[in-house]
Amino acid sequence: QRKRRNTIHEFKKSAKTTLIKIDPALKIKTKKVNTADQCANRCTRNKGLPFTCKAFVFDKARKQCLWFPFNSMSSGVKKEFGHEFDLYENKDYIRNCIIGKGRSYKGTVSITKSGIKCQPWSSMIPHEHSFLPSSYRGKDLQENYCRNPRGEEGGPWCFTSNPEVRYEVCDIPQCSEVECMTCNGESYRGLMDHTESGKICQRWDHQTPHRHKFLPERYPDKGFDDNYCRNPDGQPRPWCYTLDPHTRWEYCAIKTCADNTMNDTDVPLETTECIQGQGEGYRGTVNTIWNGIPCQRWDSQYPHEHDMTPENFKCKDLRENYCRNPDGSESPWCFTTDPNIRVGYCSQIPNCDMSHGQDCYRGNGKNYMGNLSQTRSGLTCSMWDKNMEDLHRHIFWEPDASKLNENYCRNPDDDAHGPWCYTGNPLIPWDYCPISRCEGDTTPTIVNLDHPVISCAKTKQLRVVNGIPTRTNIGWMVSLRYRNKHICGGSLIKESWVLTARQCFPSRDLKDYEAWLGIHDVHGRGDEKCKQVLNVSQLVYGPEGSDLVLMKLARPAVLDDFVSTIDLPNYGCTIPEKTSCSVYGWGYTGLINYDGLLRVAHLYIMGNEKCSQHHRGKVTLNESEICAGAEKIGSGPCEGDYGGPLVCEQHKMRMVLGVIVPGRGCAIPNRPGIFVRVAYYAKWIHKIILTYKVPQS
């Protein structure tokens, strides 16, 4: 394991930290290098350094090493914050315990077991000896510190300052005795960095010799510091990947603390009637799986042998045969008493909060095979076999029937927004399930965002309605009224459907809303001939996080010279940068004598990366957002415009490419607006229009 070792594992890392020497006599050495690993190797071997290297700083910006003969505990030194620096301190010099015989111990204990002060190694008084620092290079025979240069049985020792006692061992504890954990060590944040067989642990931020998913930046709450033993995944006790290429991982020997209590911060919220999160804190007495099969006792090995015993999983309350989640599974589960069914989830236990999905999916969830069977609004899913006719109506291939079992949430139509199910409720034929994408899953659902692959326009003809070119007509613009006042804009995309923003509906009482169509003046003055006033019959909320709503009108709008629909873009399309677009709204204009007339502001499309730069890097845009900058300083959407459209033209066809939503501020000079990207949600819109029933005119 020592052959061509990667010595960075022997260092404790403190990110964004450097050491400043207050004492000018302290030496340092610097050199340009590529990686922190190179600094570590040189520090460990003391190669070409005029001192014993105890720590180094890697300057990431300048790609430079600064080697030190001191560390953060030395006098004449202070720690300082610095974005570009990472401090690495040799653990041997800061450890206050020993591993094995303590051959590598380089701490500062200088008193023997019986309390006698140690004699300095460079002195021959009171005892003459041959253990000279010059003869034992690398063994750090400094000052009068306890050492074990030959790796002898008793551990670190020293010659004593008492002429009567030549030498004596020092009372330095084993690291395995100092380190202790509670329960199964999920909250352990100690400094044990080797396994129970003595193998050195691999750093969590390294992928060699073993590739793994536990990246510190992906799991900031798991304590993945340096190469210390941890228990991120509900194992019986802490473990680590090892530096031995033939041993992927091994448990660490960390004893249970005498006072086996958990910190409040480590305890999952205990519930007895329902599941919070993934149900790790569920302590109720449900003892059957979802279909009624009784659970096997946790302390029994019949009919299924297992290691999920109360002894292995202390603090997980593995009492009797109650459903529990000791290992961070999707939800509480148990071994079953049926010899043919090893385990089953207790999915009949309700969620304390439906919004916390107890499950996750990858990509768009088309391979999701979990057993959640409830929509995000709490409706029970209906059986797939009862809905096959409806499913065939909106997909053009044969769905995989083997996946469509029972009434579980699935994604048979390749929906971009995750698993869903039919509900059996005629008003809400189907809805998404409260399942999120798995943490760290970055599979894009649309690729090549900034490269125009798919055209947004469906056709290349100029569409004309009643002899009036739609490009001069804004009949698709809707004024959403709340308690008789204009509150938001919206776009008529079909006779019965208006696309708008989720935030435009403060009340749940649909009687509080109306849609005005065919108007130019926000108060409807002079628009009496052309105005259509329609009630709202339903709100269909967009996929989680979309901020979109499809508002169903109580009766279809009548399309005429003043009221028209606007086209949707193709799903996943990209509109070229610098395309000229417009936003429309009756919102706040910044004028004191606001005349209430529909306003337009001209914007141009900007790529997501460029847009992020304009926002000084404070916003990262994703595939569900589109950005447009103002041609005129300070023109753009504001309060009262929310829900309204960003309209662009391609091949002489006008489309709604964006929806104005709160959260990105009113039009600030040099700050482009960020809109919900309709193309990303186009399939969802079509699916709703196709599957939700609307009143006939």
Epitope: R483, K511, D512, G663
Partner: antibody
Framework: SVEESGGRLVMPGTPLTLTCTVS????????ISWVRQAPEKGLEWIGV?????VTDYASWAQGRFTISKTSTTVDLKIPSPTTEDTATYFC?????????????WGPGTLVTVSS | AYDMTQTPASVEVAVGGTVTIKCQAS??????LAWYQQKPGQPPKLLIY???KLASGVPSRFSGSGSGTQFTLTISGVECADAATYYC????????????FGGGTEVVVK
């Protein structure tokens, strides 16, 4: 967190503005409500300002109070306080952007209207 | 209007006992109801939302039920720390509302 300020002793008819300062969340994600409690009395809802800037008031509070906001503060203006307006005034974060339950409350600020 | 009526105004209960507080809406509010606990000198604290969902960190001895116009808050295995005033609040609509809160129920623990 949310925290109220501006509560003090005022004469009847002297305009008063209370401010709710928010941190750790954005007013573009959550609505904010004002609630008051007269000494030894129950909670009385005054009004709410939604994410989109629209306001709603209790029927008795309409015209007596005005709620407005900036990016990090929400103001409650009492243009002409009366002795009946003596109370502790709370601002509360509404769960979500519209009307809903209140999942975060400030400690309150005391307004005393007296001549 | 969606106004709320809470009963009783006050209730006395022994440690370990169970207390039930009722809240009635003037018209249906589906499940859009929340319950709060308030102790003297403190702001209210959310206990239950959407009629039956337990807020984060709230002990499971608190439970809520009901929908439409009739709602109940139950505290079982009452502890001394539960002595407080409890309020319901409708989270449905504020059109022409006088008060979104119920009048409150004082719980005295013996």
């Amino acid at each position: 967190s949310v925290e109220e300020s501006g509560g003090r002793l005022v004469m009847p008819g002297t305009p008063l503005t209370l401010t709710c300062t928010v941190s750790g969340f954005s007013l573009s994600s959550n609505a904010i409500s004002w609630v008051r409690q007269a000494p030894e009395k129950g909670l009385e809802w005054i009004g709410v300002i939604y994410v989109i800037g629209v306001t709603d008031y209790a029927s008795w509070a309409q015209g007596r109070f005005t709620i407005s906001k900036t990016s990090t503060t929400v103001d409650l203006k009492i243009p002409s306080p009366t002795t009946e307006d003596t109370a502790t005034y709370f601002c509360a974060r509404v769960y979500d952007s519209g009307w809903n339950h209140f999942n975060l409350w400030g400690p309150g600020t005391l307004v005393t209207v007296s001549s | 209007a969606y106004d709320m009526t809470q009963t009783p105004a006050s209730v006395e209960v022994a440690v370990g006992g169970t207390v039930t507080i009722k809240c009635q809406a003037s018209q249906s509010i589906s499940s859009w109801l929340a319950w709060y606990q308030q102790k003297p000198g403190q702001p209210p604290k959310l206990l239950i939302y959407e009629a039956s969902k337990l807020a984060s960190g709230v002990p499971s001895r608190f439970s809520g039920s009901g929908s439409g116009t009739q709602f109940t808050l139950t505290i079982s295995g009452v502890e001394c720390a539960d002595a407080a005033t409890y309020y319901c609040q409708q989270a449905y609509s504020v059109a022409n509302v006088d008060n979104a809160f119920g009048g409150g129920t004082e719980v005295v623990v013996k």
